[in-house]
């Protein structure tokens, strides 16, 4: 029986241009956790793995950081970015638990504040 | 660190039946989908056989299905191929492989030293 | 089943010198996720394989950064920027993305 549950940040903003760690938490459970993937939609953005450590995917190698720990860390935002991002547990002898992050990146306050003012 | 060891291989006559094993360490082996790979005397290497970390699907090459059959232990931490009709094109080294990453499609990091499998009357 | 096709078949290369391996493949090996299915393989005379490259460019751990793959979709490189005599061997590529996992018909490469 699956007991375990995934703690996540839930709905998180960041600005563009800057960085956001991605984190989610396996508990109440004592199963091996024997990867972690991080996709974005239907992109894999990396894979944690026991055995063999971290494997970034080629896409986004200039963009994404192992860690820290199990979590993933996003760099050079951009509005693109937006969106549900999953970590995947596979565990052993549970199975799957999955969670789930919304990202939001926002323009920077920097361009917001310049966005108030119309120059004559 | 990951070692895999097939043991198991021989002569054997044509229509004969051989099983194979394949002792897995340094892993966690019951979380890793598991192959078999042949390659006949020099020649390239073939695909024969797929099994999931939980034994629920098995996948053969054409050239096998029917006459051959993967299975694994995993309390023993042991992959099996058990090999029957046996043909004198079934003569290969034959290789047990891990897959690389957990349920990461079909391809295989790590393996075995091979065993040898000779058909012939 | 998806056919891997590998050129040249035979290479000798000088030490020092680098070497390149093509491997097309007859379908797309780039899966909706974004990674590209392909791996290389080396097996040195007397060897098992050993893995190379995974996910058509990652290295995997231990190899030399020598060694560097490319390529997305049906076309792939194995490069070898300066060729050593530990390199001698047979060079495999290798889809994973579809049952069966197919692979090249072997590259042989040797010093001259």
């Known amino acids: 029986m699956m007991t375990g549950t995934i703690e996540t940040t839930g709905n998180i903003s960041a600005e563009k241009g800057g960085s956001i760690i991605l984190q989610c938490h396996l508990s109440s459970t004592t199963a091996q956790v024997t990867q972690v993937n991080w996709e974005q939609q239907d992109q894999l953005l990396a894979i944690c793995n026991a055995d063999l450590g971290w494997h970034i995917s080629p896409s986004f190698k200039d963009r994404v950081a192992p860690g820290p720990g199990l979590g993933l860390t996003l760099q050079s935002l951009t509005v693109n970015d937006t969106g549900e991002y999953f970590c995947i547990y596979h565990t052993y002898p549970d199975g799957t638990y999955t969670g789930r992050i919304f990202l939001e990146v926002l323009e920077s306050s920097v361009a917001e504040h310049g966005a108030r003012f119309q120059i004559p | 660190q990951v070692q895999l060891v097939e043991s198991g291989g021989g002569l054997v006559q044509p229509g004969g039946s051989l099983r194979l094993s394949c002792a897995a360490s340094g892993f966690t082996f019951s979380s890793y989908g598991m192959h078999w790979v042949r390659q006949a005397p020099g020649k390239g290497l073939e695909w024969v056989a797929f099994i999931r970390y939980d034994g629920s699907n098995k996948y053969y090459a054409d050239s096998v299905k029917g006459r051959f059959t993967i299975s694994r232990d995993n309390s023993k931490n042991t992959l099996y191929l058990q090999m029957n009709s046996l043909r004198a094109e079934d003569t290969a080294v034959y290789y047990c492989a891990k897959e690389m990453l957990v349920q990461d499609y079909y391809y295989m990091d790590v393996w075995g030293q091979g065993t040898t499998v000779t058909v012939s009357s | 089943d998806v056919v891997m096709t590998q050129s040249p078949l035979s290479l000798p290369v000088s030490p020092g010198e680098p070497a390149s391996i093509s491997c097309r493949s007859s379908?797309?090996?780039?899966?909706?996720?974004?990674?590209?299915?392909l791996n290389w393989y080396l097996q040195k005379p007397g060897q098992s394989p050993q893995l190379l490259i995974y996910?058509?460019?990652n290295r995997a751990s231990g190899v030399p950064d020598r060694f560097s793959g490319s390529g997305s979709g049906t076309d792939f490189t194995l490069k070898i920027s300066r060729v050593e005599a530990e390199d001698v061997g047979v060079y495999y590529c290798?889809?994973?993305?579809?049952?069966?996992?197919?692979f090249g018909q072997g590259t042989k490469v040797d010093i001259k």
């Open positions: 290798m889809q994973g993305l579809q049952i069966p996992p197919t």
């Open positions: 379908q797309n090996l780039l899966h909706r996720n974004g990674i590209n299915y």
């Open positions: 996910w058509g460019s």
